[in-house]
């Protein structure tokens, strides 16, 4: 038997992926466990093998279909179960009725690129990946810029309160190396959270023209 507190958290990427993390204090280390998804209105069901990510937590991705296919809607509820093998049978360790559009976490933005760079400013664009068309324009973004000698944690957050897939960074220092990241969040969903940060985009501002004030 397993004692201790259990936490089972899942997010839907809005298209065809549900990612889950299960943590259990005093959990069994060498036991095979899986997440099973059973939607209340659809014909498919799906399973993924939980793999350890730390001493007492496991994670897996339920792949529901092709990455850009819409596999769930706002009317769906998916019963998610953690099942662990006990001898010849499976034991239910955790269960939740999962409302996908109340528990959203999108994929990190992709295709970051410098559109235009000057001495003091830089225009950057990006794209969202595998995001449902249901959101229309109801998305927001956060961005951050890493300056020399600072950490990402120290970088101030810039908030874009609309679906705007570009930003113009101002008041930059000439001839300086920077890095930039962005993340996205739908406005919908009680338990919706920010996507992971994008891969950092490195860029360098142009040097100031010789003999001119900067």
């Amino acid at each position: 038997a397993v004692n201790g507190t259990s936490q089972f958290t899942c997010f839907y990427n809005s298209r065809a992926n549900i990612s889950c993390v299960w943590s259990q204090d005093g959990a069994l280390q060498d036991t095979s466990c899986q997440v099973h998804a059973w939607p209340d209105r659809r014909r498919w069901n799906q399973t993924c093998e939980l793999l350890p990510v730390s001493q007492a937590s496991w994670a897996c991705n339920l792949i529901l279909g092709a990455p850009d296919s819409q596999k769930l809607t706002t009317v769906d509820i998916v019963t998610l179960r953690v099942l662990c093998r006990e001898g010849v049978r499976w034991r239910v360790m955790a269960i939740q009725d999962f409302k996908p559009f109340e528990n959203l976490r999108l994929m990190a933005p992709i295709s970051l690129q410098v559109v235009h760079v000057e001495t003091h400013r830089c225009n950057i664009s990006w794209e969202i990946s595998q995001a449902s068309h249901y959101f229309e324009r109801h998305l927001e973004f956060e961005a951050r810029t890493l300056s020399p000698g600072h950490t990402w944690e120290e970088a101030p957050l810039l908030t874009l309160k609309q679906k705007q897939e570009w930003i113009c960074l101002e008041t930059l220092t000439p001839d300086t190396q920077y890095e930039f990241q962005v993340r996205v969040k739908p406005l919908q969903g009680e338990f919706t959270t920010w996507s992971p940060w994008s891969q950092p985009l490195a860029f360098r501002t142009k040097p100031a023209a010789l003999g001119k004030d900067t």
Partner: antibody
Amino acid sequence: QVQLQQPGAELVKPGASVKMSCKASGYTFTSHWITWVKQRPGQGLEWIGDIYPGSGNTNYNEKFKSKATLTVDTSSSTAYMQLSSLTSEDSADYYCARERGGFDYWGQGTTLTVSS
Amino acid sequence: DIQMTQTTSSLSASLGDRVTINCRASQDISNFLNWYQQKPDGTLKLLIYYTSGLHSGVPSRFSGSGSGTDYSLTISNLEEEDIATYFCQQDNNHPYTFGSGTKLEIK
């Protein structure tokens, strides 16, 4: 095999109420939504609402919210739809169906006639 | 509400013909589109679910296709028993809605 049984006909007076039944067999009743659909003579299909027997959760078409009430009796694997304040506009065929990626099994339908 | 439009209300075809029935949604329904057959006696049957999934027991001459807002049901080799009215239906969002139906007759 999956079956949904509905009585063939109901005759009711205007202003009264009727409670029609849909008895399910051949599957786990509490695991699938039951939906109700209206069809006026020679007309198309209209979705009234649905109910999940496992929890009693319901969804209604706004148009039928004050007209229809959906319930279930899990002990007899039966879904019910009560229609209130009946008028001639409610005279129609009413179908129940099981939902599983579309309405995969249908009852034969109950013909409701509202007449004095 | 999502409107489902079947522009052809009736269709006449010969036995053995390939018949296509179209359905258009008022907005993108992400393939959450089903097709039903209603026989003259009122009996309703699911033919196709999620745009192209063939329901169990349905003959393989029935097929579905489409995406976004435009969908179609094809009967590849029309048989006598296919004489019926065909309805499309979206289960992308509540309230679920149906097309007005296409009545298929034999020439």
